[in-house]
Interface confidence: medium
């Protein structure tokens, strides 16, 4: 994922749409001018803003890494959405890289869930039906998410 550039010293292009701020804020897809008098449109495919803001520049669009596919392209109001390529997945506790899915289950186990961009294959013991994650055999792995945490643009 490419990094944000903090000092592009960019000026608004003449063709960019402009409007007036509302209570000091500009709408999604815009940023505020340096004199705070007008809202300037973000550049489609280059940068974006998702909410009302008083940013002097729009946020730079994410570029998907190799090993990722672009599911949704960047618009002026939404960042790029990247997804792991087929056969790889992104773990919740390692969101920065796509890991290879396992190709099969250990002996005595059967696959109950295919590889997805968000999870590895899931195996269960034939007899007991308990899950196997590849880390702790025969123990179910519980994944919890904190309610206030926003999803990464690349997950």
């Amino acid at each position: 994922i490419t990094r944000q550039s903090l000092d592009p010293q960019r000026r608004a292009a003449p063709q960019q749409k402009r409007s007036s701020p509302t209570e000091g804020l500009c709408p999604p897809g815009h940023h505020i001018s340096e004199d705070s008098r007008e809202c300037i449109s973000c550049k489609y495919g280059q940068d974006y803003s998702t909410h009302w803001n008083d940013f002097l520049f729009c946020l730079r669009c994410t570029k998907c890494d190799s090993g990722e596919v672009e599911v949704n392209s960047c618009t002026t109001t939404r960042n790029t959405v990247c997804q792991c390529e087929e056969g790889t997945f992104r773990e919740e506790d390692s969101p920065e890289i796509c890991r290879k899915c396992r190709t099969g289950c250990p002996r005595g186990m059967v696959k109950v869930k295919d590889c997805t961009p968000w999870s590895d294959i899931e195996c269960v013991h034939k007899e007991s039906g308990t899950k196997h994650t590849g880390e702790v055999p025969a123990v179910e792995k519980t994944v919890t998410t904190s309610p206030g945490t926003p999803a990464s643009p690349c997950s």
């Epitope: 903090l6 000092d7 804020l25 909410h51 009302w52 002097l56 520049f57």
Partner: antibody, heavy 121, light 111 residues
């Protein structure tokens, strides 16, 4: 390349005054909010205050607003911090910083190397 | 003032493992869909360097091993895999309102 050169630090007696300077280069100084942040030896970071490009808005951390005065001279690309009534707890490394673009206030994208102020009798 | 509480105060992580640093704000630092929380790295004898801004945006030139997440009052900086050069003190900072404040810092040691 954005650069800051702080100066004016040194040994000062309790109750005394000192004026720190920060000369900026590598960007259009007159367009940017500027801040001072300090760090006592072995301690964390404390924001002192900031000044807008036209010097008509100056914000301070409440506990310091009666002892410190922030000013700037855009013609000289220089930021100042006038320290008065200093005490031993003002002993710190004083950093000149430039905020980044977004929001008001924003985060501190660029920092100088700092100038050390030691308050001691 | 918004108080930022970082935990742990120090941690030691083996090379290649994950370092997780938390920062809790005394009130929400999110507004209008943005989280005004930023992360810095400071090495001995150097000024702080911004790593992540607005909760999750990686600054220019910062390796993708660093990631930030969170909203409201709870924020996390993750470093994975940890490298030798990551030994430093890490600070969170909010800019939700005045005055901006910093967390107390987390010292990361590499085992």
């Amino acid at each position: 390349e954005v650069k800051f050169l702080e100066s004016g630090g040194g040994l000062v007696q309790p109750g005394g005054s000192l004026k720190l300077s920060c000369v900026a280069s590598g960007f259009d100084f007159s367009r940017y909010w500027m801040s001072w942040v300090r760090q006592a030896p072995g301690k964390g970071l404390e924001w002192i205050g900031e000044i807008n490009p036209d010097s008509n808005t100056i914000n301070y951390t409440p506990s310091l607003k009666d002892k410190f005065i922030i000013s700037r001279d855009n013609a000289k690309n220089t930021l100042y911090l006038q320290m008065t009534k200093v005490r031993s707890e003002d002993t710190a490394l004083y950093y000149c910083t430039r905020r980044a673009y977004y929001g008001n206030p924003a985060w501190f994208a660029y920092w100088g190397q700092g100038t050390l102020v030691t308050v001691s009798a | 003032d918004i108080v930022l509480t970082q935990s742990p105060a120090s941690l030691a992580v083996s090379l290649g493992q994950r370092a997780t640093i938390s920062c809790r704000a005394s009130k929400s630092v999110s507004s209008s869909g943005y989280s005004y929380m930023h992360w810095y790295q400071q090495k001995p004898g150097q000024p702080p360097k911004v790593l992540i801004f607005l909760s999750s945006n990686l600054d220019s030139g910062v390796p993708a091993r660093f990631s930030g997440s969170g909203s409201g009052t709870d924020f996390t900086l993750n470093i994975h895999p940890v490298e030798d050069g990551d030994a430093a003190t890490y600070y969170c900072q909010h800019s939700r309102d005045l005055p901006p404040t910093f967390g107390g810092g987390t010292k990361l040691e590499i085992k």
